[in-house]
């Protein structure tokens, strides 16, 4: 049978190295060898590249080598497949070398900021040695911040034949480390070089970018003072490398700037003790280059009525995220503050907060929260300087079975009845939302029975028991992940009720 007609011929000109063509099929049923017929020098010269019968038969690739690699030029390529049964030729394909030229990558030798020019990096590289001298090269510069996986790209061309080239990359973040890599190609070519080795550079430092500011209002103390826990952090979008030397805080009662108090701290939290009036609080961060813009917060008066506009809230889990969504009756509110912290019996150890704009949902990666921990999540509406009433919910990113079952006791044991009571499992041992409780009970040598009740029930009266019989019983608490049994208890129903026995005694 004749070999298959060679198709999908693809050629590439590795500048000053070789001109290589590949085709399909790559494997033939019977032994096949190939002859690649090339015309070059604009059609006035011709030669043949053969796949060697012994070593490279059935190998669908052939390379033409210097000195007959002419450039610029147009080549034609025709591949001929031959086996014992005959010859099959491909169609003739036409190749303009300028369009299929692949050159070596450039070499970046420096990525530096230029003194006094903000948010810019100057990239300097060496044009590849193996590249046509007079040709315009097109470049793709890829860059990303050092802690990001997302590359950004910028394309440009360079006509000069200087071996030493530069490009100024602007509109970057201040004081941020960037990774750069560069590739190039002759302007007309469809083939890019490989990427250069990556080089890192850092933009110049600036005065701090800004702060996000929040507070936790605590109950008033006996003497009427209100503790307010202020907290702040670098604003979203601030450079990763940004470091503040310190923070200035000043605050005063509304309409009374004469009573301004100031505090300087290097911490990112500070507790204020305020009176019952409305207060204004201002915080700036500073470094050796200056101050950040002012972050402002209004602390409402003790008796101020706060607005309420969140009507419902849901927390749901995706494969790797926790998503909280809420519904609001106030379309004008487009900023929200989200707080989250573990619901533990002790004081909140890790309190977190984040601002959300122009959205009514908030997302966090599951791996930022601990599995088997219950989190309290509160969302506050923020309208200009006013903070509304929060709406709260609880969520687990991963539920497990409880670490311990309920502690159970049998009360009011009767002839045919018993009342079982059990204690709630401590928060730290629940590992999920308790969905229900199941009471398992069994008479000595008898069949086991069970009864499931809602999670808000902590007591249950069992009836239709057998008199004067020993029972074993345990209560299982279940989450979505499964259940855990509590301690097993034993009790024996009475032979005669206390009430009946008492009556008999009096007669």
């Amino acid at each position: 049978v004749l070999p298959a007609k060679p198709e999908n011929i693809s050629c590439i000109f590795y500048y000053e190295e070789n001109f290589t063509c590949t085709w399909s099929p790559e494997k033939e049923a019977s032994y096949t060898w190939y002859k690649v017929k090339r015309t070059y020098s604009y059609g006035y010269k011709s030669d043949i590249c053969s796949t060697d019968n012994s070593t490279r038969g059935n190998h669908a690739s052939c390379s033409f080598l210097p000195p007959t690699i002419t450039n610029p030029d147009n080549y034609t390529i025709q591949v001929e497949a031959q086996n014992a049964d005959g010859i099959m030729k491909s169609d003739i394909t036409y190749w303009n070398l300028d369009a299929i030229m692949k050159i070596e990558p450039p070499e970046i030798f420096s990525v530096k900021s230029v003194l006094g020019i903000k948010r810019m990096l100057q990239i300097k590289w060496i044009r590849p040695v193996l590249a046509p001298h007079s040709s315009t090269l097109k470049y793709t510069l890829r860059f990303r911040t050092i802690n990001s996986a997302y590359w950004m790209e910028v394309n440009f061309t360079k006509e000069d034949i200087d071996r030493d080239e530069t490009y100024n990359l602007t509109e970057l973040q201040a004081f941020t480390e960037y990774v750069m890599t560069l590739r190039c190609a002759p302007a007309e070519s469809m083939f890019w070089s490989g990427w250069s080795q990556e080089k890192v550079g850092t933009t110049e430092e600036e005065a701090p970018y800004g702060l996000d500011l929040w507070r936790v209002l605590k109950p008033a103390m006996v003497d009427g003072r209100r503790p307010v826990q202020l907290m702040w952090k670098k604003a979203t979008g601030a450079p990763v490398l940004e470091k503040a030397l310190g923070y200035n805080i000043w605050y005063f009662p509304e309409n009374n700037t004469n009573l301004t108090e100031t505090v300087n701290t290097t911490n990112q939290t500070h507790e204020l003790y305020l009176g019952g009036k409305t207060y204004w609080v201002y915080v700036v961060s500073y470094n050796s280059l200056g101050e950040s813009p002012v972050a402002t917060l209004r602390i409402p008066a003790l008796n101020e009525k706060t607005f309420q506009c969140i009507e419902a809230m849901q927390a749901c889990l995706t494969q790797d995220q926790l998503v909280v969504e809420w519904q609001s009756s106030a379309p004008e509110v487009d900023t929200w503050m989200v707080e989250w912290f573990p619901d533990v019996d002790s004081e909140p150890s890790s309190f977190s907060w984040e601002s959300v704009s122009q959205a009514r949902n908030w997302t966090i990666q599951k791996d930022e929260l601990k599995p088997l921990w219950c989190y309290n999540i509160s969302v506050y509406p923020v309208l200009r300087d006013r903070v509304g009433q929060p709406y709260s919910t609880q969520a687990y990113v991963q539920e497990g079975i409880p670490s311990a079952g309920p502690v159970t006791q049998a009360d009011s044991i009767g002839v045919k009845t018993v009342t079982i009571t059990w204690k709630e499992i401590p928060k730290s041992k629940r590992n999920g939302f308790i969905k229900n409780y199941t009471i398992f009970y069994q008479a000595e040598d008898g069949k086991e029975f069970s009864k499931t009740v809602n999670s808000n029930i902590l007591q249950y009266r069992l009836e239709s028991l057998t008199r004067r019989t020993s029972y074993s019983l345990q209560v299982m608490a279940s989450t979505n992940a499964g259940g855990t049994n509590g301690t097993k208890i034993n009790f024996k129903t009475l032979s005669i009720s206390h009430h009946h026995h008492h009556h008999h005694h009096h007669h």
């Epitope: 059609g43 006035y44 011709s46 034609t76 030729k89």
Partner: antibody, heavy 119, light 107 residues
């Protein structure tokens, strides 16, 4: 205009040698192969061989190996065919030609040189 | 070397006749066959390349066909200006070889 100019005729004695010239205009011979073809009334056309003027590599039909030598002078854009040990069998018209491989044909022919071998 | 056997050697035809010339290669030359026309006192001119492709400007009464070893050249309606010698040539492998030619004469 692309042209190949050859001398009109050569009369040579048997056993002697002759060197035919072919001067190109309108193109650089280094970018082509220069071929030579023999024409005799009864035998038709016969390909003698070709040269790559860029590197001097030449290729001959087995029949003309030892009989013909093809050379070039790129500075004068000229190709040469030297025929040695001439006999009456070498009496013919000799054409230089440029071959266009994309459509497999001699696209430019020389004017032809008539060689007569006679005592 | 590949031998190209061309037949017939001579053809005497009238204007308007159909003419067929054949060329047989001593081994497969795939479709690497060219047909030339050589008019008296001129150098050869290309008519057909790759066995069946008509060259630019060549009238469509000239056609070619074949693959492997057997090739045919046809003039569908001979005209007075077609008086010439017609050659086949292979460039599948070196050395190039020509057929011995067919001389077409018009009655």
């Amino acid at each position: 205009e692309v042209q190949l100019q050859q001398s009109v005729a050569e009369l040579v004695r048997p056993g002697a040698s002759v060197k035919l010239s072919c001067t190109a205009s309108g193109f650089n011979i280094k970018n082509t192969y220069m071929h030579w073809v023999k024409e005799r009334p009864e035998q038709g056309l016969e390909w003698i061989g070709r040269i790559d003027p860029a590197n001097g590599n030449s290729k001959y039909a087995p029949k003309f190996q030892g009989k013909a030598t093809i050379t070039t002078d790129t500075s004068s854009n000229t190709a040469y065919l030297q025929l040695s040990s001439l006999t009456s069998e070498d009496t013919a018209i000799y054409y230089c030609a440029r071959y266009y491989y994309v459509s497999s044909h001699f696209d430019v022919w020389g004017t032809g040189t008539t060689v007569t071998v006679s005592s | 070397s590949i031998v190209m056997t061309q037949t017939p050697k001579f053809l005497l035809v009238s204007a308007g006749d159909r003419v067929t010339i054949t060329c047989k290669a001593s081994q497969s030359v795939t479709n690497d066959v060219t047909w030339y026309q050589q008019k008296p006192g001129q150098s050869p001119k290309l008519l057909i390349y790759y066995a069946s492709n008509r060259y630019t400007g060549v009238p469509d009464r000239f056609t070619g066909s074949g693959y492997g070893t057997d090739f045919t050249f046809t003039i569908s309606t001979v005209q007075a200006e077609d008086l010439a010698v017609y050659f086949c040539q292979q460039d599948y492998s070196s050395p190039f070889t020509f057929g011995s030619g067919t001389k077409l004469e018009i009655k």
